[in-house]
């Protein structure tokens, strides 16, 4: 019996078609990915195939303005109208708390949502109960097949699930669900979940019974043969992992934001046992035409994003300088706002010990790309945002070490004076340089913030210490110059849209005065 | 469609001026510091000017200081070259690019300046 | 900053493998970019920060190096390859490499 499994993970509001690097489309012959374009290839597959099955791996919440202002109802809209059959939650699906999970797409979808680790305590358990399962049952074909869900148990330290939800070890709470499938004749089991290929690699050693793990969170492009655009393979796919066991489990994963479509086909023997799987995902590109009905109703949909980006979310009281002649060579206040916003939006009170689990930011100032007038009435929209913040970033966390930290900070000002993007913005920070120094030996005073305080204060910067830093996606791939960062980051987990971060701190603040206020100084 | 469309080239005499123009669409010129390049014939590519994306920093080839001034106008998404006391390995085409970005980087056509009496 | 390519020329056939090499004058981190130039047009970023591949370009395309020496390599070159290749520089004021030029053999 052959079952062919199409999915996609970390999707992350990418409803319209993007460029090849998952930005707003600019050139439409050349652009990818969007619902409309993934409906279309979809369709196609199930004409052509008689058991076939749609999966999402979690992460459709943030990443765009699609996100900001429909909070999730239009991935339940869209999602129903492809027909989806399960979806995981990811730890993005909170980031709205728990309310903006149950609501509009807990309540609005059409197909089950699954996470086996998480568990409900106090009154939140019979309000969310049965809105999310920990597996479900489908029947494909003359078949039945049992998908399991999992959720990354790092959630409440990169979203905002509240107190009354428990994140269980994924491998833990996966094993006895597992158990019970199989006590209901269910031979065929798919893991579908979100905590990272390294997570999806080890349930597939170690979950007795799964046959299939279709995973999400790391952004993972796995491919066979030549990879048709610019993502480079981390494996094959599918992976192959042999489990505990002895048997042969295929572990797939398909890039991130909808620019390809997972496309694994598998074969079972009568007893429910993986024969052969093969595939790899698909390439959503201009090739695959839009659907006319998904695009129309897009559209549609578009109108309200558009009167959005002129709505005041705020207003500042102070000219907020963005100038390049500012943020590429000193302390400017707008990097002190996007910093504070970064790390106002990681505010995760997890642990008693802790005040909170990140206090540092660092922010190229090169990626700052306007100013914002006070003289406009102090009206700041999305727009404004859109434009000090153009590339469409995330604001991720990371784990460094303290040596590596002082590395970037070299760097931040091995070749000051040329106006160049790597100079960094801080929160969290107090860093003086002395440029009468050699490259390389600029720093001469790192402090950070302390996070294990009942009172924050500034300590020196310990080299061999591990420490919890906010940065754009940017810097965490190595930009600006920052292969440091690259190398040797420890953990990274992606965050929300950059432009949707800022905007929520100023709808939050009302009103803002952020000063130039001795992060960085010069001796 | 994101476009870069240079004009103002033409034939000039050593010692003359000629103002180039770029005109910019298709994105956010605001957003993005901007390039002169320039390509004698036959010859490789030699670059020229750089403006920051909001106009308040600005560098220079060796061979066109004080004679080249590169500026923009980001309300009417233009960018700008004026060329002064123009000298014979002046003459090249002359392109207007953006710098390497999130999104790679975006070139012109080009226009030709020839400078000879 | 000064850029050195070398060769200046080349000539290969389809199917080989080609290697271009650009030295700088003093160490440059990963600032380095690629560029191809075919007659007449625009030139068209291939590799930037010495190893990122740009979007669009064949993946047959790669970069490498750090410091100085820096290296952009061709897996197997195919028809549409045959044009000049330059390096640039952007640690400092930005410098192109004098040019490669590929041609068919």
């Known amino acids: 019996w052959e079952l062919t499994i199409l999915h996609t993970n970390d999707v992350h509001s990418r409803l319209e078609q993007t460029s090849e690097d998952s930005s707003k489309c600019v050139n439409a012959s050349r652009c990818m990915g969007g619902v409309a374009r993934l409906f279309t290839k979809v369709q196609q597959i199930r004409r052509a195939e008689p058991n076939v099955l749609l999966l999402d791996a979690g992460d459709q919440y943030q990443g765009t303005i699609w996100f900001t202002v429909y909070k999730g109802a239009e991935v339940a809209h869209f999602m129903n109208a492809l027909r989806y059959d399960a979806m995981a939650l990811g730890n993005h699906e909170f980031d709205n708390g728990v309310e903006g999970l149950i609501e509009p797409l807990l309540k609005e979808a059409k197909f089950p949502i699954l996470s086996a680790n998480i568990k409900a305590k106090g009154p939140l358990a019979s309000q969310i109960s049965g809105l999310y399962l920990p597996y479900k049952v489908l029947p494909v074909g003359d078949e039945v097949v049992g998908i399991v869900g999992y959720t990354s148990k790092e959630t409440p330290f990169l979203s905002n699930p509240g107190t009354n939800l428990v994140f269980e070890d994924e491998i833990t709470a996966l094993q006895p669900e597992v158990d019970k499938l199989k006590t209901l004749n269910v031979n065929k089991i798919i893991a579908l979940g979100h905590s990272g290929f390294e997570m999806d690699k080890l349930i597939a050693q170690k979950v007795r019974g799964v046959d299939v793990v279709v995973g999400g969170h790391s952004n993972t492009f796995l491919y066979t043969g030549n990879p048709p655009s610019k993502e480079v393979p981390a494996g094959k796919y599918p992976f192959i992992v042999t489990s505990d066991d002895g048997r042969k489990v295929p572990v797939v994963q398909a890039y991130a934001f909808g620019k390809y479509l997972g496309y694994l086909k598998i074969e079972f023997d009568e007893r429910g046992n993986v024969i052969s799987s093969h595939g790899n995902p698909i390439l959503l590109n201009s090739s695959i035409p839009e659907d006319p009905s998904i695009k129309a109703d897009i559209n549609k949909w578009r109108i309200k994003l558009d009167n959005y980006s002129t709505q005041e979310l705020g207003k500042t009281i102070v000219y907020l300088d963005g100038s390049s002649q500012s943020c590429r060579f000193r302390e400017c206040n707008m990097g002190n706002l996007i910093c504070d916003a970064m790390i106002n939006n990681n505010l995760r009170h997890t642990d008693e010990m802790f005040w909170n689990h990140v206090s540092m930011c660092i922010l190229n100032g090169g990626g700052i790309r306007s100013p914002i007038d006070e003289r406009n009435n102090g009206t700041i929209t999305w727009e404004n945002l859109a434009a000090v913040l153009p590339f469409g970033g995330t604001f991720d966390l990371v784990q460094l070490k303290g040596s590596t930290l002082k590395k970037a900070f070299e760097h931040s000002v091995h070749r000051y004076g040329q106006s160049t993007g790597e100079f960094l913005q801080v929160g969290g920070i107090h860093v003086v340089y002395d440029l009468s120094r050699k490259p390389g030996d600029r720093v001469v005073k790192l402090d950070v913030l302390c996070t294990k305080c009942r009172v924050p204060s500034y300590d020196p910067l310990k080299m061999d210490e591990v420490y919890k830093v906010i940065l754009p996606n940017f810097l965490a791939n190595g930009g600006d110059g920052f292969q440091m960062i690259k190398d040797e980051l420890l953990r990274h987990d992606s965050g929300d849209q950059d432009i949707n971060v800022v905007s929520t701190y100023i709808s939050k603040m009302k009103v803002i005065y952020p000063a130039v206020e001795g992060r960085i100084k010069f001796s | 469609e994101v476009q870069l469309v240079e004009s103002g080239g033409g034939l000039v005499q050593p010692g003359g001026s000629l103002r180039l123009s770029c005109a910019a669409s298709?994105?956010?010129?605001?957003?993005?510091?901007m390039h002169w390049v320039r390509q004698a014939p036959g010859k490789g590519l030699e670059w020229v000017a750089v403006?920051?994306?909001?106009?308040?920093?600005?560098y220079y080839a060796d061979s066109v200081k004080g004679r080249f001034t590169i500026s923009r106008d980001n309300s009417k998404n233009a960018l700008y070259l004026q060329m002064n006391s123009l000298r014979a390995e002046d003459t090249a085409v002359y392109y207007c690019?953006?710098?390497?970005?999130?999104?790679?980087?975006?070139w012109g056509q080009g226009t030709l300046v020839t400078v000879s009496s | 900053i000064q850029m050195t390519q070398s060769p200046s020329s080349l000539s290969a056939s389809v199917g080989d493998r080609v290697t271009i090499t650009c030295r700088a004058s003093?160490?440059?981190?990963?600032?380095l970019a690629w560029y191809q130039q075919k007659p007449g047009k625009a030139p068209k970023l291939l590799i930037y920060?010495?190893?990122t591949l740009q979007s669009g370009v064949p993946s047959r395309f790669s970069g490498s190096g750090s410091g100085t020496d820096f290296t952009l390599t061709i897996s197997s070159l195919q028809p549409e390859d045959f044009a000049t290749y330059y390096c640039?520089?952007?640690?400092?004021?930005?410098?192109f490499g004098q040019g490669t030029r590929l041609e068919i053999k």
């Open positions: 003093q160490g440059i981190s990963n600032y």
């Open positions: 920060a010495a190893s």
């Open positions: 403006m920051s994306y909001d106009g308040s920093n600005k």
């Open positions: 690019a953006t710098e390497i970005a999130a999104k790679g980087d975006y």
């Open positions: 298709g994105f956010t010129f605001s957003s993005y510091d």
């Open positions: 640039q520089q952007s640690y400092s004021t930005p410098h």
